[in-house]
């Protein structure tokens, strides 16, 4: 019965998941959602680096209202969109000491969501109905991911922020039936 999609004023459908992968331990320990940490120190040579952390990509912000049928959020939400190709941090067009745009010749680096956050929205509905409380999943930061032809499908699904979405109208099932299955379901990250 929960929502399966949110719609903005441009009628773009933004699917929503009830369950997301847990962040790797290093993300949980070393990053907060407030920091969009893309890239690190510049590589010694822009074409030879093998460390994905040394690549960066652009984060674009846009604002939209969340709607569901006749109901619309009282305030807009600001979303982060991971955009563009990845290149060494020091060669990005918006970096200090602008260099030319770097085009990878070997493996492809894609700009994908790194961390997620939740934002509660207050939905105002016509007819004097009480406002509804909903959480939307928003991207908090972006990262570069190396993609080669050897990547299998399970790794590729990392690219779509909603790659493993449940069927419409169906509640997501727990991913694992281990002793920690329920914990995983409650503890998963935004």
């Amino acid at each position: 019965q929960g929502w399966q999609a949110f719609k903005n004023d441009a009628t773009e459908i933004i699917p929503e998941l009830g369950e997301y992968p847990e962040p790797p331990p290093e993300l949980e320990n070393n990053k907060t959602m407030n920091r969009a940490e893309n890239g690190g120190r510049p590589p010694h040579h822009p074409f030879e680096t093998k460390d994905v952390s040394e690549y960066s990509c652009r984060e674009l912000h846009f604002t939209r209202y969340v709607t569901d049928g006749p109901c619309r959020s009282a305030k807009p939400v600001t979303e982060l969109v991971c955009s563009g190709q990845c290149g060494p941090a020091r060669l990005l067009p918006n970096a200090i000491g602008r260099g030319k745009w770097w085009r990878p010749s070997g493996p492809d680096f894609r700009c994908i969501p790194d961390r997620y956050r939740a934002q509660r929205v207050q939905l105002l509905c016509p007819g004097g109905e009480a406002p509804r409380a909903r959480k939307v999943r928003l991207v908090a930061s972006c990262k570069c991911k190396r993609l080669t032809r050897f990547h299998n499908q399970s790794e590729l699904k990392d690219f779509g922020t909603e790659a493993a979405r449940p069927q419409k109208g169906r509640k997501p099932r727990p991913r694992a039936r281990s002793a920690k299955a329920n914990q995983a379901e409650l503890e998963n990250a935004y």
Partner: antibody, heavy 121, light 108 residues
């Protein structure tokens, strides 16, 4: 291990204010909403409001008519609830409660131990 | 505000009994936003079931939840000594979030 540790019991006079703290540990503080719920003696639980520590976004129960203010200090992983213009009926146990990260529910999966606030002249 | 009415408000039962608690809402509540908590005297509430029917971490399988719309139920299939407590339903479909009045389960 996730833990929410609240400040100690308070005794206040009518008209005063009280500020209760809730220190979070064992998880990334900015990743989860924090709710405040109170329970007067022998009464049902009553939701007061919540805060998104990521961006300081707050929502309050209109019942408290501007008397409640929820804040946070991300550097200390601590949430605060301040209730002003206290009256005797505000005597209650006040709980902070972390909201689960599951996007399609607003359930509260971890609770503080509670802070007893007594309002008496 | 959405009113949640629990019945019965008091329940006397024996170990091994099957117990059912009902939560009725004044308006239809989306099942994803209906939760159940257990509270023992002097303790904080503990999440039992979220989204109507999902068991929270560490909660025994003898607890189950069901329902939709305006009527939801919590069932304990075989009451255990540690289950004697007060149970609350909660909705956070509509602002503000509200709780039921509680059902106290005592030993017969």
């Amino acid at each position: 291990e996730v833990q929410l540790v609240q400040s100690g019991a308070e005794v206040k006079k009518p008209g005063a204010s009280v500020k209760v703290s809730c220190k979070a540990s064992g998880y990334t503080f900015t990743d989860y909403y924090m709710n405040w719920v109170r329970q007067a003696p022998g009464q049902r639980l009553e939701w007061m409001g919540d805060i998104n520590p990521y961006n300081d976004d707050t929502t309050y129960n209109h019942k408290f008519k501007g008397r409640v203010t929820i804040t946070r200090d991300t550097s200390a992983s601590t949430a605060y609830m301040e209730l002003s213009s206290l009256r005797s009926e505000d005597t209650a146990v006040y709980y902070c409660a972390r909201e689960t990260a599951v996007i399609t529910t607003n359930a509260m999966d971890y609770w503080g131990q509670g802070t007893t606030v007594t309002v008496s002249s | 505000d959405i009113q949640l009415t629990q019945s019965p408000s008091f329940l006397s039962a024996s170990v091994g009994d099957r117990v059912t608690i009902t939560c009725r809402a004044s308006s239809s509540v989306t099942s994803s936003y209906l939760n159940w908590y257990q509270q023992k005297p002097g303790k904080a509430p503990k999440l039992l079931i979220y989204s109507t029917s999902n068991l929270a971490s560490g909660v025994p399988s003898r607890f189950s939840g069901s329902g939709s719309g305006t009527e939801f139920t919590l069932t304990i299939s075989s009451l255990q000594p540690e289950d004697f407590a007060t149970y609350y339903c909660q909705q956070y479909d509509f602002f503000p979030s509200t709780f039921g009045g509680g059902t106290k389960v005592e030993i017969k």
